[in-house]
Every structure is written in structure tokens, then in C-alpha cells.
Interface confidence: low
């Protein structure tokens, strides 16, 4: 049969190049000498020359490291012709998936996030949501799965755990009672986003929470 199994290649491969991936083989080679070629994006059209084929053996070659964040799947066509140039097989689809390495850190969408909440609210009240992105894969692997955490809170009054952050959604909520604008009008939280679902690379940003007045003080004359 004129087939090749779909191929998976890790991105950022170290080589040496060219690297043999898989062998195209037509069973018509029993009857006549076969010459192999490949076409498609990554072979003879942009980005040209990423893949090649050994004309007489059918070995599919990778010529350089791949970047999944640029192109995650290549689709090439394999061709087999006899010595006189006549096609001996229909073009064959060759599917090459680029598998992910954790080569990107998370990035917060803003350096500083701002939110506000009324003083005296109950624990569990949502304040704001922060977002970080990671270009790595988050479907097949945890490389691009971001976990959020609060690194520090300033000031630490009335204590240092006034807020919590949902590890997967980035929603910041009040976790403790005692928010009092007259004492602390604003909190600065240093927040972290860590890929590998919390076990990888970390990046930080700032979340500023303004405490709004609930008009809870009687006027003084």
C-alpha cells in the first residue's frame, strides 16, 4: 500500500539535521524503480524547504527545528513516479503535527489591573478578573495551562489574607471581612501566573483594589 502514518515531531528539535522522520514507500517498487517527491507548504511552497525527501529511498527529512507557535500542523503530499516520469500512485496526504515544548512564559494582558469593591462586603464577593495568556499548547499538554496566585498584599491590614484568586479563572475575591475604606482605601496585590498548571514558569503583575465608601459613618457636627 501507498501509505504513511501521520507523524508527530517535537518543536525546537536539536537535530542533527536533516533528521529522518518516516519512509514513503510504494509497493510498485517491486515492478519498477520509483522516485519520490513531496509538495505543499513546508516543502515546495512557503515556508519552503522545511521538509524534503530522499528521492530514491523515500525517507522524509526534517531540515530544521520547528516552531509549533508559528505552524502547528503541516500537510504535505507525497508523490511516486517511475523512471520515465509517469505517476505510479495518487498523491498521498502526509499529516505532520508539531508537538509542544514549554518554550513560552505566561504573559499578563496588563501590567496593572484595577478593580474596586465596597467596604464591609461579605467574604466571597468578586472584585475583578485578571488574565494571562501563554502561547504554548493547553489542550494536549499543561504547557500553556496557567494557574493564578497572589504573591503578596500591601498593606497587610487588618491582616495579609484579605483576598484570594481563583487559580484557573483569575477571579479575585474578598476572602475576609474587615475591609474598611477609612483605614485602608487601597490594596496592592502582586499576582502571579504560572504555566504547567502551577509547576512551570512564572510571571507577575499588579492588581490594585480600591475600597469604595459605603457611607457607614454618621456625620459629626
Amino acid at each position: 500500500d501507498w501509505v504513511v502514518a501521520p507523524i508527530s515531531v517535537p518543536e525546537n528539535g536539536k537535530g542533527p539535521f536533516p533528521q529522518r522522520l518516516n519512509q514513503l514507500k510504494s509497493n510498485k517498487d517491486r515492478d519498477t524503480k520509483i522516485f519520490y517527491s513531496i509538495t505543499g507548504p513546508g516543502a515546495d511552497s512557503p515556508p519552503e524547504g522545511v521538509f524534503a525527501v530522499e528521492k530514491e529511498t523515500g525517507w522524509l527529512l526534517l531540515n530544521k527545528p520547528l516552531d509549533r507557535e508559528e505552524i502547528a500542523k503541516y500537510e504535505l503530499f507525497g508523490h511516486a513516479v517511475s523512471e520515465n516520469g509517469a505517476s505510479v500512485e495518487d498523491p498521498m496526504n502526509i499529516s505532520i503535527i508539531v508537538t509542544d515544548q514549554n518554550d513560552h512564559k505566561p504573559k499578563f494582558t496588563q501590567d496593572t489591573f484595577r478593580g474596586s469593591v465596597l467596604e464591609g462586603v461579605l467574604p466571597g464577593t468578586s472584585v475583578m478578573q485578571v488574565t494571562a495568556t501563554d502561547e504554548d499548547d493547553a489542550i494536549y499538554t499543561y504547557n500553556g495551562v496557567v494557574a493564578y496566585s497572589i504573591h503578596s498584599q500591601e498593606p497587610k491590614d487588618p491582616h495579609d489574607l484579605m483576598f484570594t484568586i481563583h487559580r484557573s479563572t483569575g477571579t479575585i475575591s474578598v476572602i475576609s471581612s474587615g475591609l474598611d475604606r477609612e483605614k485602608v482605601p487601597e490594596y496592592t496585590l502582586t499576582i502571579q501566573a504560572t504555566d504547567m498548571d502551577g509547576d512551570g514558569s512564572t510571571t507577575t503583575a499588579v492588581a490594585v483594589v480600591e475600597i469604595l465608601d459605603a457611607n457607614d459613618n454618621a456625620p459629626m457636627f
Epitope: P6, P41, E75, N93, T99, D137, Y140
Partner: antibody, heavy 118, light 112 residues
Framework: QVQLQESGPGLVKPSETLSLTCTVS????????WSWIRQPPGKGLDWIGY???????NYNPSLKSRVTISVDTSKNQFSLKLSSVTAADTAVYYC????????????WGQGTMVTVSS | DIVMTQSPLSLPVTPGEPASISCRSS???????????LDWYLQKPGQSPQLLIY???NRASGVPDRFSGSGSGTDFTLKISRVEAADVGVYYC?????????FGGGTKVEIK
């Protein structure tokens, strides 16, 4: 969140070129595949082609000779041109986003009806 | 091209009852990476299609857990454990293993 909006003329004359633009708002055009899909009245869905933000394209062979998909990253837009149209090209045209390497269309535009008629 | 065949063409359902749609591909959609490149979409009346299931069995964000996808290779099934009135529309399967990406002909789900 990310939204897609198709725009372009609703009526095109036979033999002319159909031109549509899809504007991506609420997110970047980078790191995704951007496709055009069409649906003739009362029929199923047909994939036209995709463009990757790095400008790699892939077209349905049934339309390849007539289709061009291009991207303008500075405007966060991608476009479809379909030349030499006939009545058979009358359809609702959707733009859609596919996650890198997964190829499932997770976000769709609302679609725009294009009629080919003189 | 990979040909996708859905059955049934039309599926009358009773709210609260289960429903099942079949999709068959003309060649295996199982990639050596271990995933089936098969997606399910629902097109509600007058709306764009929406993604329900990707890579054979993964529910898309916001999709209720009454929807589930199963199968491998060439035979796939979409199941709705308890149909609701909001589930009416045309369901499409699509193969994403290789281009041209191809859709099934659709299954119209309607309330009895």
C-alpha cells in the same frame, strides 16, 4: 471576548469577484487559523480555506483556482476573494477561528448572505 | 477527500429523553498523537454553528455536560443524555485530520 464580523456586498453579478472581510475584535489575530466556510440556502457546510497569521494558506481544491484568502494583521482582519462567481456560489458565508493545531472552529461570525445574480 | 456520513437525517426527540447521532468517516481520523480529529457542531435555527465537541470527546467551553462525544477511528457518536427544547437544530460532524476539512450532511433534531 473575541468576536468575528463579516462584511461585504450582499449582491454580486455573475463572472465578477466576491469580496468579503472578517474583522476580529476583542483579541489578536496571531496564533490562530482563520477560515471561511459557506452554506448554500437549505444545505450543509462547505469549508473554503484557511489562512494562518503567518500567511500560510490552504484552500479547498474544489475552489482553489478561484480563491484567495489574505490577512492584514495591522487591522486585525482577514479577507476572502472568490473570482468568476456563478449562481452556485450563492450562500451564507461565515468566517471562523480555529485553535492552533486543533482545527475545531471555536468562534464563528454571524454570517453574511451573498447572492449571485444579474 | 474524506467523506463524512451522518445518520439519521432527521431525529424527532422527546424532551427529557436521550438522543444519539452517528457519524462515519471514509478513513480513520485517529492521529498518531492519540487524538481523533472529529468535531461536532450545532446550528440552531437562524444562527451560526457553535462548537460542541472537539477532538472526538472534549466538550467545548460552556457546553452542558449532557452532551458527550465518543468513538474512534471511523465511527463516532454524539449523545445527548436528556434533550431540552434548546437543543433543537442541525448537528454536524466535521473531520479536521486533513484538508479539505469536510462536514457531514447534518442531522436535524426536532421536538416531537
Amino acid at each position: 471576548q473575541v468576536q468575528l464580523q463579516e462584511s461585504g456586498p450582499g449582491l454580486v453579478k455573475p463572472s465578477e469577484t466576491l469580496s468579503l472581510t472578517c474583522t476580529v475584535s476583542g483579541g489578536s489575530i496571531s496564533s490562530y487559523y482563520w477560515s471561511w466556510i459557506r452554506q448554500p440556502p437549505g444545505k450543509g457546510l462547505d469549508w473554503i480555506g484557511y489562512i494562518y497569521y503567518s500567511r500560510t494558506t490552504n484552500y479547498n481544491p474544489s475552489l482553489k483556482s478561484r480563491v484567495t484568502i489574505s490577512v492584514d494583521t495591522s487591522k486585525n482582519q482577514f479577507s476572502l476573494k472568490l473570482s468568476s462567481v456563478t449562481a452556485a456560489d450563492t450562500a451564507v458565508y461565515y468566517c471562523a477561528r480555529a485553535r492552533n493545531g486543533i482545527d475545531a472552529f471555536d468562534i464563528w461570525g454571524q454570517g453574511t448572505m451573498v447572492t449571485v445574480s444579474s | 477527500d474524506i467523506v463524512m456520513t451522518q445518520s439519521p437525517l432527521s431525529l424527532p426527540v422527546t424532551p427529557g429523553e436521550p438522543a444519539s447521532i452517528s457519524c462515519r468517516s471514509s478513513q480513520s481520523l485517529l492521529h498518531s498523537y492519540g487524538y481523533n480529529y472529529l468535531d461536532w457542531y450545532l446550528q440552531k435555527p437562524g444562527q451560526s454553528p457553535q462548537l460542541l465537541i472537539y477532538l472526538g470527546s472534549n466538550r467545548a467551553s460552556g457546553v452542558p455536560d449532557r452532551f458527550s462525544g465518543s468513538g474512534s477511528g471511523t465511527d463516532f457518536t454524539l449523545k445527548i443524555s436528556r434533550v431540552e427544547a434548546a437543543d433543537v437544530g442541525v448537528y454536524y460532524c466535521m473531520q479536521a485530520l486533513q484538508t479539505p476539512l469536510t462536514f457531514g450532511g447534518g442531522t436535524k433534531v426536532e421536538i416531537k
